[in-house]
Structure formats: C-alpha cells, structure tokens
Interface confidence: medium
C-alpha cells in the first residue's frame, strides 16, 4: 500500500507520458490523477514502467472503479492486464 502524500510542487502529471518512469511510487500515487490515467490508458504500453510502478497505477484504477473497470479501460489495459487477479476480472461487466 502506497501511503498518501502531497504531490511536490511542479510534479503534477498533466498527461501520461514517458517522464513518469522517473517518478517514485509515492510520486505516482500523489501526482497522477486516476481519471486522467483512465482516459489515457492506451499510452501505458508505450512507457517502460517497472512492475512496482504498474502496481501503483493499478491501485489508482482500483480506487477509481471499486466495482470493476468500465469497458473503455479494459480495452486499453495492455501490460497492466498482467497485474489483474481473477477477483479483479470477475468484477468486469464485459459485453
């Protein structure tokens, strides 16, 4: 679990891009907006995140969608799918 910390000045992520690989886990948690992540999931595959960073991104999506991810997010999970458990997948309402 990544503890809640304020995002340092100037570090708020305006978009999901390559600069985020140099963010520490707590910075990703504090500085990446979950709704922004959900709308830009297609970019994640183009960014060489570490497994630890993927964990944080998944945690953010889990908080945003506690009842399960919408289809728009599921379709663009890409490598983040590696982090999904059977319990996560059971929540999805895929048509």
């Amino acid at each position: 679990e990544v503890e809640k910390t304020a995002c340092p000045s100037g570090k708020k992520a305006p978009e999901i891009d390559e600069s985020l690989i140099f963010y520490k886990k707590w910075e990703l948690e504090a500085c990446v907006d979950a709704a922004l992540l959900a709308t830009q999931m297609d970019r994640v595959n183009a960014i060489p995140f570490t497994y630890e960073q993927l964990d944080v991104l998944k945690h953010k999506l889990d908080e945003l969608y506690p009842q399960g991810y919408p289809e728009s997010v599921i379709q663009h999970l890409g490598y983040l799918f590696l982090k999904m458990s059977p319990e996560d997948i059971r929540k999805w309402n895929v048509t």
């Epitope: 690989i21 140099f22 520490k24 960014i47 060489p48 995140f49 570490t50 497994y51 630890e52």
Partner: antibody
C-alpha cells in the same frame, strides 16, 4: 540465434560526435525495447537509456540526456546511439542490450558485442 | 538513484570451493535484481533474474538469493572458468543501476 552486432572500435577527436550502431538479428526487432549501457574500465556499468523500435519512444538517464540521442532504423533492424561533444570521460565500451521478453523485466537477456570508443586528439 | 554496492571488488577462492558474492541496495528493491557474468573483452551474460531465477543454460552451481536490500550470488563447486567479473543490477526503479562488480580470483 538472437544477436546484436556492433562495430569493434571508434577513434574520435575531442569535441566531435559519433553515431554507434547495433544491428539486430534472429528476432523481431520491433517487439523489444533496446537499452544502451556504458562501461568504463574498472568503473562498472551505467545505464544510458532505452528506445522502443516500433514506436520510437525514448527514455534517458538524466546523466546522459545532453550526451546521447537514441534512434532506430526499422528497415535495417538497427539501433543507433549518437554521442555528442565527446571528451575523455566518454572513452568507454558502449553496449546495446535487449531487455527480457516480459514487460516489466528490465534486465538484459541479450547484449551486443560492444563498441570501444576512444576519444583522443 | 538507487546505489548497488558490491563491497568486495576482488574475492579469492579455490577450484571446488563455494563462494558468495554480495550486493546491497541503498533502498528496498524487492526482488528486482539480476546478476551478470563478464569475461575480459566480452559483453556481460545474464545469470540470474528476479533475484533467484536462473537464466536458461546457466549451470546449476550458480544460485541467487535475497530480497529487499541484501542479495547474494552463490557459486558452488567453483570451476576455473568461473574466475571472472560479476555484476548485480536493480530494475526496481529508474535509472536502472549496477554494482561496481566483483572479480573472482584464484587464492
């Protein structure tokens, strides 16, 4: 089998630039991220940066941001690294290295043969 | 940056011995550690990844262990062809970083 072929050596004058090549064979070049690593005698290894051959996405170690530029030529399955404003500190062996086949596994399962860059007037 | 410290630049051993090469990370890296072997004038070769998983074709005498900040590469029944340089690397966070290396020498 999987191979990354690099020229053996380059002799460069101080202040000049050099473009190092890394020709891949034996696998689908566009499917794997490619890294570049520097090794100076007795000083271990330093990660320079990474490029995805298919999408051209690059990331650099902050220490090399103004020194190295990574590019690829998909048609020839070749990765390139340009080093600029060379000094004696840049004299080293430079390796290209393919990351493992699994996303998130940022270790290197295949290394290039290495190019020895010597900066000397 | 995460610093990977290999405290012994050189280690002495004898053929048939068991030797342990250590690597310490400056912060927790989980099990995101790889070990490489390097012959003089050649490129490094992957031995171990995820701290303890042997790469394909690596002899069973090479084993890796550890998690968090302390990692060990153990060579059982050292052979003369093992007297080489060994490097650790963390891939928990960027920039990816390596240890300075440990050179195995004959006693």
């Amino acid at each position: 089998q999987v191979q990354l072929q690099q020229p053996g050596a380059e002799l460069i004058k101080p202040g000049a630039s050099v473009k190092l090549s890394c020709k891949a064979s034996g696998y689908t070049f566009t499917s794997y991220w490619m890294h570049w690593v520097k090794q100076r005698p007795g000083q271990g290894l330093e990660w320079i940066g990474i490029i995805h051959p298919n999408i051209g996405s690059t990331n650099y170690n902050e220490r090399f941001k103004s020194k190295a530029t990574l590019t690829v030529d998909k048609s020839s399955s070749t990765a390139y690294m340009q080093l600029s404003s060379l000094t004696s500190e840049d004299s080293a062996v430079y390796y290209c290295a393919r990351r493992s086949s699994n996303y998130g596994d940022w270790y290197f399962d295949v290394w290039g043969t290495g190019t020895t860059v010597t900066v000397s007037s | 940056d995460i610093v990977m410290t290999q405290s012994h630049r050189f280690m002495s051993t004898s053929v048939g011995d068991r030797v342990s090469i250590t690597c310490k990370a400056s912060q927790d890296v989980g099990t995101s550690v790889a070990w490489y072997q390097q012959k003089p004038g050649q490129s490094p070769k992957l031995l171990i990844y995820w701290a303890s998983t042997q790469h394909t074709g690596v002899p069973d005498r090479f084993t890796g262990s550890g998690s968090g900040t302390d990692f060990t590469l153990t060579i059982n029944n050292v052979q003369s062809e093992d007297l080489l340089d060994y490097f650790c690397q963390q891939y928990s966070s960027y920039p990816l970083t390596f240890g300075a290396g440990t050179k195995l020498e004959l006693k």
